[in-house]
């Protein structure tokens, strides 16, 4: 007869490991007992369980409530056991010793490998600002057994570098993603992808890039100067900029306070019916935590050509 077993049994942390040991013998042969032991290079052989043909399974104190026979139907020649809820410390070499009648004793060894799936974590780097050189955007760390693979999935141009730290029963892998920040990256996804034999599918953690910037300011509303005449209603100036974080806007008049009735509403300066007093230099101030910008325009309110009191007699003038 001979023992049918497996050189390597692989199980994911927390799952049940079936340690196989089946005696393939002649029809008249019987298995008396199967002794299971843990073989440790430092501690030697430690008994794990004894499976007796007549009296069932008796388990070592260290494995109480953790070792069972596989569920029925059971073959009397099958000495396999189930190791419940495998933990990392269970990884190692196991031995089954089968006592048969009349053929004698047989033994076989197998290695139990416990896969520890990683629980990845993503840590954003320091705040990104346009104008910086090569900067850490994010780092991603995953620890498992065996060592996981950590890569990045993104449309953003950058460089990635990895390093790993070996522990007694696992390895931690950290991958960093560096880039030169630009405003076009703002809102772009940066995804850490972790692969491991203990995972059914890759684990993905996405970080949305935030690049601080502040665009130059400009003012819209003076495209047609002829519209800025006395009496016109609803005249506005709008300050144009963009930034991350979103900027705050403020309006001032260079040559004095804002005329009465002129209202500031965010990026927009609203005028009451225009008078010549509204002429002047207006400054739009844009700022966020990163920077501040300004843009100024000169408003010249023209006299209303239809106002007879202000009409010029061209004939007499000539």
């Amino acid at each position: 007869g001979e023992l049918e077993t497996s050189d390597l049994v692989t199980v994911v942390l927390g799952q049940d490991a079936k340690l196989p040991c089946f005696y393939r013998g002649d029809p008249d042969e019987q298995v008396g007992q199967v002794a299971w032991a843990r073989v440790d290079p430092n501690e030697g052989t430690r008994e794990l369980a004894l499976l007796h043909s007549k009296y069932g399974l008796h388990v070592s104190p260290a494995y109480e409530d953790r070792v069972e026979q596989p569920p029925p139907p059971r073959d009397p020649l099958d000495g396999s056991i189930l190791l419940r809820n495998a933990v990392q410390a269970d990884e190692g070499e196991y031995e089954c010793r089968v006592s048969t009648f009349p053929a004698g004793s047989f033994q076989a060894r197998m290695r139990l490998r416990v896969l520890v799936p990683p629980l990845p974590s993503l840590n954003p780097g320091p705040p990104l600002e346009e104008g910086q050189g090569l900067t850490l955007a994010a780092s991603c760390t995953a620890e498992g057994s065996p060592a996981p693979s950590v890569t990045w999935d993104t449309e953003v141009k950058g460089t990635q570098s990895s390093r790993s730290f070996k522990h007694s029963r696992s390895a931690a892998v950290t991958s960093e993603f560096h880039l030169v920040p630009s405003r076009s990256m703002n809102g772009q996804p940066l995804t850490c992808v972790v692969s491991h034999p203990g995972l059914l599918q890759d684990q993905r953690i996405t970080h949305t890039l935030q690049v601080a910037f502040l665009a130059e300011a400009s003012v819209r509303g003076l495209e047609d100067q002829n519209l800025w005449h006395v009496g016109r209603e609803g005249a506005t100036l709008k300050c144009l900029s963009e930034g991350q974080p979103p900027p705050k806007y403020n309006w001032t008049r260079l040559d004095g306070p804002l005329p009465s009735g002129v209202r500031v509403k965010g990026d927009t300066l609203g005028f009451p019916p225009l008078t010549t007093e509204h002429s002047g230099v207006y400054v739009c101030h844009v700022s966020n935590e990163l920077s501040s910008r300004a843009s100024q325009v000169t408003v010249e309110v023209l006299a209303d050509p239809e106002d007879p009191g202000k009409q010029v007699d061209l004939v007499s003038a000539s």
Epitope: E43, E47, L48, L50, H52, Y55, H58, V59, P61, A62
Partner: antibody, heavy 122, light 111 residues
Framework: QVQLVQSGAEVKKPGASVKVSCKAS????????IHWVRQAPGQGLEWMGI????????SSAQKFQGRVTMTRDTSTSTVYMELSSLRSEDTAVYYC???????????????WGQGTLVTVSS | QSVLTQPPSVSEAPRQRVTISCSGS????????VNWYQQLPGKAPKLLIY???LLPSGVSDRFSGSKSGTSASLAISGLQSEDEADYYC???????????FGGGTKLTVLG
Amino acid sequence: QVQLVQSGAEVKKPGASVKVSCKASGYTFTSYYIHWVRQAPGQGLEWMGIINPISGRTSSAQKFQGRVTMTRDTSTSTVYMELSSLRSEDTAVYYCAKEGVGGELLRAFDIWGQGTLVTVSS
Amino acid sequence: QSVLTQPPSVSEAPRQRVTISCSGSSSNIGNNAVNWYQQLPGKAPKLLIYYDDLLPSGVSDRFSGSKSGTSASLAISGLQSEDEADYYCAAWDDSLNGFVFGGGTKLTVLG
């Protein structure tokens, strides 16, 4: 060699408690269960309970439940059995015994302590 | 009153063969292994037979064990004076969830 060495004889008054120790040597202490068995003068053997030396989990005979406490100290490979509310009929030799035979995990006691005589008398 | 029943005493002449019986039920002997212990006067018990019929190393093969149904027996052949002792059978009891012992049998070697 494998052995269990117990503490010395004790004399106790009724109602008191006694704590008997059993120090293991010559084998991996946490690998085998330890049982406690007692024998009253001129009487047979009586099983009291079992302790898992690695987890400290215990199970005792119904007769002793609530009165017997089994503990262990893995740092010294020692098991303790404390019996409370002693009465005269608890006068007996108390034995600790290692489960297993020649390293195999069998439900039999291959190594016994030398015994500790506990006398309960007023 | 012990869960397992043994005769209180047996006696036989030297060089003869003696048998000690042990009777139980399906929850102990019927379903579990039987062990036999020898206790010499003033000494701790010693394992003699385990798992019905197996001898620990160092035990003389003059001792043998057997089991049938809910009964077990210990046989000692070629009796010697040093075999004079108390003999106990024991088994795990599934109902009581603990070990049970027989009341013990005192063996006297005559002559």
